[in-house]
Interface confidence: low
């Protein structure tokens, strides 16, 4: 079952996916489309990586991340309600059935009506290095010392707008559990 | 290892098309994407676009965005640049480009006259 | 569209070192925009040089090196050859396009 996650229309939807390079800059394919992933490749690819490089996106998907060290997590950008469903990030490791697959669920909801818009928080910046992915060794050094390792089994993506005075309500609203 | 050959010069007066066309030969094509990347007499590089065969699916630099088409042609491993309403300014050498930017077509002058 | 921006020109004298950089109208250039470095010399075709800010590609000397350097992408040449003289350019990717720098010639002195 998808874990889901939410953001508001007009939001940047903050997707994360995350593998382990054996090495910086040894990097493996990773294909991002929407629809749950098949059993080969990603449907409807929105963002592909090679070995190198980004080398194929559409309009409003691109990573924010260091995905030299293996961020590939997704950020769409000014999220519509039709952004709403399924998202698979595949981390295409060599070998046969090898490819690590993550079906994660958005749900956008309508932009609330505040008198002043709010600040939004690039995750990246403010949290670096929290997520670490299944079977691809440990985690790096934690960098916020108060939140345990996040394992990306439990976790698959968080809201885009993690502010420090709502981080544990906006885990506990994504579904996310902290070990 | 995959090499890029591109079309022949071209001269052509303003506000007509032209096509360019880009041969991959020793590599997978579909899966690579194909790049297009101008440059001017004098002037600079200028990324205009690409393409993944294999999706069909282009992508266009804002400047150049309802004026240039890109396809690809998986049956010939053949990827195509589309520009039209030709100015003066867009006389310039047109590369294509695959493999992250790394492997580079021979480039093709386009001269825009009338 | 976005602004990428580097030194028109640099001069250096043969076995020095020198730094490129490569700053985007948007603010800081990070690792995210995958900065790739280009060389050009007259009347051929760019050569692919470095890749996703600090990767060398099998073919290049290990005196190019790249970087990210007061929120600008970097390339520092050490020991220069008289070879190096081209012109370099960066390439950055704004999620859903790529863009140029406007080069920067170097000349090597000698």
């Known amino acids: 079952s998808e874990v889901e996650y939410r953001a508001e229309v007009g939001q940047n939807a903050y997707l994360p996916c995350f593998y382990t390079p054996a090495a910086p800059g040894n990097l493996v394919p990773v294909c991002w489309g929407k629809g749950a992933c098949p059993v080969f490749e990603c449907g409807n690819v929105v963002l592909r990586t090679d070995e190198r490089d980004v080398n194929y996106w559409t309009s409003r998907y691109w990573l924010n991340g260091d995905f030299r060290k293996g961020d590939v997590s997704l950020t769409i950008e000014n999220v519509t309600l039709a952004d709403s469903g399924i998202y698979c990030c595949r981390i295409q490791i060599p070998g046969i059935m090898n490819d690590e697959k993550f079906n994660l669920k958005l749900v956008i909801k309508p932009a609330k009506v505040t008198p002043a818009p709010t600040r939004q928080r690039d995750f990246t910046a403010a949290f670096p290095r929290m997520l670490t992915t299944r079977g691809h060794g440990p985690a790096e050094t934690q960098t916020l010392g108060s939140l345990p390792d996040i394992n990306l089994t439990q976790i698959s993506t968080l809201a885009n707008e993690l502010r420090d005075s709502r981080l544990a309500n906006d885990l506990r609203d994504s579904g996310a559990t902290i070990r | 290892q995959v090499q890029l050959v591109q079309s022949g010069a071209e001269v052509k007066k303003p506000g007509s098309s032209v096509k360019v066309s880009c041969k991959a030969s020793?590599?997978?094509?579909?899966?690579?994407?194909i790049y297009w990347v101008r440059q001017a007499p004098g002037q600079g590089l200028e990324w205009m676009g690409s393409?993944?065969?294999?999706?069909?699916?282009?992508n266009y630099a804002q400047k150049f965005q309802g004026r240039v088409t890109i396809t690809a042609d998986e049956s010939t491993s053949t990827a195509y640049m589309e520009l039209s309403s030709l100015r003066s300014e867009d006389t310039a050498v047109y590369y294509c480009?695959?493999?992250?930017?790394?492997?580079w077509g021979q480039g093709t002058l386009v001269t825009v006259s009338s | 569209q976005a602004v990428v921006t580097q030194e028109p020109s640099l001069t250096v004298s043969p076995g020095g070192t020198v730094t490129l950089t490569c700053a985007s109208s948007?603010?800081?250039?990070?690792?995210?925009?995958?900065p790739n470095w280009f060389q050009q010399r007259p009347g051929q075709a760019p050569r692919a040089l470095i890749y996703t800010t600090n990767n060398r590609h099998s073919w290049t000397p290990a005196r190019f090196s790249g970087s990210l350097l007061g929120g600008k992408a970097a390339l520092t040449l050490s020991g220069v050859q008289p070879e190096d003289e081209a012109d370099y350019y960066c390439l950055l990717y704004y999620g859903g396009a790529w863009v140029f720098g406007g080069g920067t010639k170097l000349t090597v002195l000698g």
């Open positions: 393409i993944i065969p294999i999706l069909g699916t282009a």
């Open positions: 020793g590599g997978t094509f579909s899966s690579y994407t």
């Open positions: 480009a695959s493999a992250s930017h790394t492997i």
């Open positions: 948007t603010g800081a250039v990070t690792s995210g925009y995958t």
